[in-house]
Amino acid sequence: QDRHMIRMRQLIDIVDQLKNYVNDLDPEFLPAPEDVETNCEWSAISCFQKAQLKSANTGNNERIINLSIKKLKRKSPSTGAERRQKHRLTCPSCDSYEKKPPKEFLERFKSLLQKMIHQHLSSRTHGSEDS
């Protein structure tokens, strides 16, 4: 569905915005899913969204950082797949993922979102369609 594609694309843009301010983020290590197993992607996204990413409170950029983090955590309307995955007991818990500093955390988040966009497009017919 287009609205889910838009939401994933928006999340990528927010991640890119935060990557510009990576030096102003709290350097705490955060669980960062990588090589997420099939059918656990939405579960992993919720792990990224739950992570305690925060500003290092270093002045000038604090407002935009906090706004970006808030938007990153905002839940979008769930798809059936998303709801099923979140209740799957077989998906790894957030704590089980390797912890990484903010820069790698954001890179892994973006990588997962890009993978999901690719999967979403691959599951659609390759004909003439709206972007």
């Epitope: 287009d2 966009i117 497009l121 972007s131």
Partner: antibody, heavy 117, light 106 residues
Framework: QVQLVQSGAEVKKPGASVKVSCKAS????????MHWVRQAPGQGLEWMGL????????IYNQKFKGRVTMTRDTSTSTVYMELSSLRSEDTAVYYC??????????WGQGTLVTVSS | DIQMTQSPSSLSASVGDRVTITCRAS??????LNWYQQKPGKAPKLLIY???RLHSGVPSRFSGSGSGTDFTLTISSLQPEDFATYYC????????FGGGTKVEIK
């Protein structure tokens, strides 16, 4: 059908500010973010930034940071782009473009801003 | 920032010709590339998104290919209405446009 209608041409003096509007219709305004893109005479396209139409979250091209402000009015389904401290190099056509799933899928007709003393 | 370089900057062709425009990214952008068409005095129009997917209403003579850093827009048989300027645009990291390729009548 989707339509983005922009405000008319402007002539400004160097150092002044300009505010361009873009009124959206034919879809739910707050469902889609909006981009702003400009094009200097005879030149290519330059992305300026985007705004989340459901709140006031913005992402700006670093080149324009501090000079550009994007806002919106949900009551009139209109987005605005204000550029301050204008210089002659800011003479361009300014476009709003809807943030589609993976591309700028609909564009306004453009607004010519001329900066001249 | 990701830079996008288009070539050629202009080309002359005749109706019925096969036309190829290339776009190169300064770093790997996977398939995050769009193509737009712009006619004089008009706003750009989306042609192709995500490297190879035709936007609705775009004729099938337009096609796109590539991945990573090198991309191509092909018009299989140029029509009179195709004389215009074409821009590539990356959306891997925010947005950047190429410099454009003007397709003129020979």
């Amino acid at each position: 059908q989707v339509q983005l209608v922009q405000s008319g041409a402007e002539v400004k003096k160097p150092g002044a500010s300009v505010k361009v509007s873009c009124k959206a219709s034919g879809y739910t305004f707050t469902d889609y973010w909006m981009h702003w893109v400009r094009q200097a005479p005879g030149q290519g396209l330059e992305w300026m930034g985007l705004i989340d139409t459901s709140d006031v979250y913005t992402i700006y091209n670093q080149k324009f940071k501090g000079r550009v402000t994007m806002t919106r009015d949900t009551s009139t389904s209109t987005v605005y782009m204000e550029l301050s401290s204008l210089r002659s190099e800011d003479t361009a056509v300014y476009y709003c473009a809807r943030y589609g799933p993976l591309a700028m899928d609909y564009w306004g007709q453009g607004t010519l801003v001329t900066v001249s003393s | 920032d990701i830079q996008m370089t288009q070539s050629p900057s202009s080309l002359s062709a005749s109706v019925g010709d096969r036309v190829t425009i290339t776009c190169r990214a300064s770093q790997d952008i996977s398939n995050y590339l769009n193509w737009y068409q712009q006619k004089p005095g008009k706003a750009p129009k989306l042609l192709i998104y995500y490297t190879s997917r035709l936007h609705s209403g775009v004729p099938s003579r337009f096609s796109g290919s590539g991945s990573g850093t090198d991309f191509t827009l092909t018009i299989s048989s140029l029509q009179p209405e195709d004389f215009a300027t074409y821009y590539c645009q990356q959306f891997h990291t925010l947005r950047t446009f190429g410099g454009g390729t003007k397709v003129e009548i020979k």
